[in-house]
């Protein structure tokens, strides 16, 4: 129950990629506004996105303080123009979000192949170490900085002229693979956190092929 002209938010959903984290919900407001609160399991509630008509709230600044914590958010509904009004229980209507642990649940963003360099019959493929919004000592940490060895990359590669795909993995952001001289190869990479139970893999990177500008060839 609540005031006659407000409805509780529903379908509260965390949308998070590389720790950029937004809480979304429904419905689109009609004569009402929302305020979001976020808390760790043991912490105090902090209000964000005050009296907004949006149905999303960027909570990145809060969750990056400790990405290994588990967070809970709640969305309060208020009548537009009368935000002091409360429900029959003496407080505004609200709905809780599912719990969210960024380190375990944030989606891995699509990686990018930074470069590849051929030297003879070997190709060194380097994956860009994407910057996140997680900070330490006033600097932004990269994905590798945050996840360490929990993060691996899988390389898919194949001859330009065939469909047979090979794979390799690495615990760094580099691969060094054997290729046939005189053949052009194409590459795609995927970020993986093997220890996870959900959101283990990113989407594949865009395909990069030898003979294009990202590559370099040396005898």
């Amino acid at each position: 129950s609540g005031t006659t002209n407000t409805v509780a938010a529903y379908n509260l959903t965390w949308k998070s990629t590389n720790f950029k984290t937004i809480l979304e919900w429904e419905p689109k407001p009609v004569n009402q506004v929302y305020t979001v609160q976020i808390s760790t399991k043991s912490g105090d509630w902090k209000s964000k996105c005050f009296y907004t008509t949006d149905t999303e709230c960027d909570l990145t600044d809060e969750i990056v303080k400790d990405v290994k914590q588990t967070y809970l958010a709640r969305v309060f509904s208020y009548p537009a123009g009368n935000v002091e009004s409360t429900g029959s229980a003496g407080e505004p209507l609200y709905e809780n979000s599912p719990e969210f642990t960024p380190y375990l649940e944030t989606n891995l963003g699509q990686p990018t192949i930074q470069s590849f360099e051929q030297v003879g019959t070997k190709v060194n493929v380097t994956v860009e170490d994407e910057r996140t919004l997680v900070r330490r000592n006033n600097t932004f940490l990269s994905l590798r900085d945050v996840f360490g060895k929990d993060l691996i990359y899988t390389l898919y590669y194949w001859k330009d002229s065939s469909t047979g795909r090979k794979t390799n993995t690495t615990h760094t952001n580099e691969f060094l693979i054997d290729v046939d001289k005189g053949e052009n190869y194409c590459f795609s990479v995927q970020a993986v956190i093997p220890s996870r139970t959900v959101n283990r893999k990113s989407t594949d990177s865009p395909v990069e092929c030898m003979g294009q500008e990202k590559g370099e060839f040396r005898e």
């Epitope: 940490l141 360490g148 760094t172 060094l176």
Partner: antibody
């Protein structure tokens, strides 16, 4: 070449916190390796305690996780181990080690290739 | 956790003989993550083999590693006096990283 040196008290009282520091010389702690702590009980095998990256990213042995904190100080080129609520069962030689990437089969994997000499810690009242 | 069982516990051999040390895992281990270490009394362990079969720089070619899945082997083709020590296998693919209980190679 890189060398590691453990330091800290050799005697700790039961229920107190064991604190050790590993100083890295001959290389930067921020150069893409991981830094580990391993212990060896008297006359026994090796037990991995945990590791840290220069960014502060850590992994711990679940059997010790509730009592262990590993931290890094890049300005001093050091990393540290704290083990709380110690008992006689924590008496051991404690080693720090570098976990460095080695090329294998198309990718790079980490192995503990440089170790400190080890420091003996006895837990006793 | 992955349990590594080494056998035999002690191997008594003479210099010049061949030593075969076994390491069996409780579940499959990707060979990329399998290493062998040597430890002498009063010293820290030393990395010998990584990736199950690749010798670390400076390790003599009398040391060789093999195996995959759950069964791995360290072979010392001709024992030198300095090879008498304790040998540990280790997996670094799954947390917690674990070591075998060790095989002591002693002079017969």
């Amino acid at each position: 070449q890189v060398q590691l040196q453990e330091s800290g008290p050799g005697l700790v009282k039961p229920s107190q916190t064991l604190s050790l520091t590993c100083t890295v010389s001959g290389g930067s702690i921020s150069s893409g390796q991981y830094w580990s702590w391993i212990r060896q009980h008297p006359g026994k095998g090796l037990e991995w305690i945990g590791e840290i990256y220069y960014s502060g990213s850590t992994r711990y042995n679940p059997s010790l996780k509730s009592r262990v904190t590993i931290s890094v100080d890049t300005s001093k080129n050091q990393f540290s181990l704290k083990l709380s609520s110690v008992t006689a069962a924590d008496t051991a030689v404690y080693y720090c080690a570098r976990d460095a990437p080695y090329y294998y089969g198309g990718g790079y994997y980490y192995y503990m290739d440089v170790w400190g000499k080890g420091t003996t810690v006895t837990v006793s009242s | 956790e992955i349990v590594l069982t080494q056998s035999p516990g002690t191997l008594s051999l003479s210099p010049g003989e061949r030593a075969t040390l076994s390491c069996r895992a409780s579940e499959s281990v990707d060979s990329s993550y399998l290493a062998w270490y040597q430890q002498k009394p009063g010293q820290a362990p030393r990395l010998l083999i990584y990736g199950a079969s690749t010798r670390q720089t400076g390790i003599p070619d009398r040391f060789s590693g093999s195996g995959s899945g759950t069964d791995f082997t360290l072979t010392i083709s001709r024992l030198e006096p300095e090879d008498f020590a304790v040998y540990y296998c280790q997996q670094a693919g799954v947390v917690p990283y674990t070591f075998g209980g060790g095989t002591k190679v002693e002079i017969k």
